[in-house]
């Protein structure tokens, strides 16, 4: 956004920001806005929280339109009331080993976090906490009513789930790439991030991509067939253009989205790929952003618990990214 014009703000008064989020002036020094937080999309008009040492990382200079809020190199992390230095590792609980990297906490699960899909020998998988054990384990529940028999089992399909890319050694560099995190939004345009050292300098860097698990305006429950409880990957009737902060994708996409369930299960991306998408902005500028495209979704009971940010992150992470 060009800052040379007169300042005019939205008609409503200054916004009320959530606890811990700063009320700041936009990048033009015009209007009061709630500062964007770590990992959120930012623009010149929607700045990152300066009180947390964040800046808007636009990536390549050609894309100075929309970026991701990133902590300055070497920024410490505040986690659970404790301050950790950048590069410091710590165990947050028996389930997670965490590392602070430039203001962001990244955690690897110490427990298996695989998504287990129904199969003929285990049609109703469920995770349970066993006494005396830290990690939850899979158990196979019996169906409540014995109606799934015979040909109906053909509806079950084993899906490949992939863990992190196998580590590689390349020119004295142990290449490691974490899984893509869950999309920051359950509907609409969000971002997904990962950490990798798969670069020429073997230096840890944060990568991000746009993601859309499902459109917000879609009323997906209406499409669930009679007698069914889920619609896993609903058919999108027409190709769509993606929108990002006033810019529109130059191409239309017949994208897949994840559906919904009516029985408490949640549907999340299972296999994804990352492709570049070009956006054209009202001022004619074109920018290229990487975006997640869904190949398959999985519906499961491992829905993220609101009280556990790590389960939220790792039960919903993206498996099998092809890019």
């Amino acid at each position: 956004q060009n800052c040379s014009g007169p300042c005019r703000c939205p008609d409503e008064p200054a916004p009320r920001c959530p606890a811990g989020v700063s009320l700041v002036l936009d990048g033009c020094g015009c209007c009061r806005v709630c500062a964007k937080q770590l990992g959120e999309l930012c623009t010149e008009r929607d700045p990152c929280d300066p009180h947390k040492g964040l800046f808007c990382d636009f990536g390549s200079p050609a894309n100075r339109k929309i970026g991701v809020c990133t902590a300055k190199d070497g920024a410490p992390c505040i986690f659970g009331g404790t301050v950790y230095r950048s590069g410091e590792s710590f165990q947050s609980s028996c389930k997670y080993q965490c590392t602070c990297l430039d203001g962001a906490v990244g955690c690897m699960p110490l427990c298996s976090m695989d998504v287990r899909l129904p199969s003929p020998d285990c049609p109703f998988p469920r995770r349970v906490k066993l006494p005396g054990k830290c990690c939850e384990e899979w158990v196979c529940d019996e169906p409540k009513d014995q109606t799934v028999v015979g040909p109906a089992l053909a509806a079950y399909r084993l899906e490949d789930t992939f863990g992190p890319d196998p580590t590689m050694i390349r020119a004295n560099c142990l290449v490691q790439t974490t899984e893509w995190s869950a999309c920051s939004k359950t509907c609409g345009m969000g971002i997904s991030t990962r950490v990798t050292n798969d670069n020429a300098s073997c230096r840890l860097e944060k990568q991000s991509r746009l993601c859309m698990v499902r459109p917000c305006e879609a009323d997906l429950e209406e499409n669930i067939k009679k007698g069914k409880k889920c619609i896993r990957t609903p058919k999108i009737s027409k190709p769509i253009k993606f929108e990002l902060s006033g810019c529109t994708s130059m191409k239309t996409y017949r994208a897949k989205f994840c559906g919904v369930c009516t029985d408490g299960r949640c549907c999340t991306p299972h296999r994804t790929t990352t492709l570049p998408v070009e956006f054209k902005c009202p001022d004619g500028e074109v920018m290229k952003k990487n975006m997640m495209f869904i190949k398959t979704c999985a519906c499961h009971y491992n829905c993220p618990g609101d009280n556990d940010i790590f389960e939220s992150l790792y039960y919903r992470k993206m498996y099998g990214d092809m890019a």
Epitope: G5, P6, R8, C9, A14, C30
Partner: antibody, heavy 119, light 111 residues
């Protein structure tokens, strides 16, 4: 009652300086932009400058930028116009105005203070 | 952006309708999509007062006999039934582009 009261005007020689003040009352000062608008004798209105909530952004009429400065002190509910190297053509009534920064511009005006530049 | 008002003087009888035109030298649509065209009245010996903002919105306390309309570069202020207290100089103003500019003023006076 919402009120703006200007002060600091007077007679000054060409090349001289003046500092106009505007004291605001009756509203939350830091929730509004403030502005200065002037009116030469027998002439129309001319926008001079405005300033954002905290004083971190100021916009001035390009022809006045090198000589005039707008500033504010939210603790004192006041806005100022520092005028240097004054010329005869700066002679005018200077109005302080509240700028909503949203739908409308100048929704409250002061009574004005007269600046006369003459030798 | 130059704002040109017509007429410069408008003699009216009390109770008549009055219409003032304001034309901008270029489109005054702000980059946010709004048109910041305003009308001010300066009564004799007084400070200006806001009447209309964003082309057609009356400021609080402004009688409904005042109405604003227009788009692009052509705008109009109408007073449906002129009253004695309406006399003075009317200015249009654009706040969409720098420098912010006023029209030269239209003097509404009794015939």
């Amino acid at each position: 009652e919402v009120q703006l009261v200007e002060s600091g005007g007077g007679l000054v020689q060409p090349g001289g300086s003046l500092r106009l003040s505007c004291a605001a009352s009756g509203f939350t000062f830091s929730d509004y932009y403030m502005a200065w608008v002037r009116q030469a004798p027998g002439k129309g209105l001319e926008w001079v400058a405005n300033i954002n909530y905290y004083g971190s952004r100021t916009d001035l009429l390009a022809s006045l930028k090198s000589r005039f400065t707008i500033s504010r002190d939210n603790a004192k509910n006041s806005v100022y116009l520092q005028m240097n190297s004054l010329r005869a053509e700066d002679t005018a009534v200077y109005y302080c105005a509240r700028d909503t920064s949203r739908g409308s511009y100048f929704d409250v005006w002061g009574a004005g203070t007269t600046v006369t530049v003459s030798s | 952006v130059v704002m040109t008002q017509t007429p410069l003087s408008l003699p009216v009888s009390l109770g008549d309708q009055a219409s003032i035109s304001c034309r901008s030298s270029q489109s005054i649509v702000h980059y946010n999509g709004n048109t910041y065209l305003e009308w001010y009245l300066q009564k004799p010996g007084q400070s200006p007062q806001l009447l209309i903002y964003k082309v057609s919105n009356r400021d609080s306390g402004v009688p409904d006999r005042f109405s604003g309309s227009g788009s692009g570069t052509d705008f109009t202020l109408k007073i449906s039934r002129v009253e004695a207290e309406d006399l003075g100089v009317y200015y249009c103003f654009q706040g969409s582009h720098f420098p912010l500019t006023f029209g030269q003023g239209t003097k509404l006076e009794i015939k």
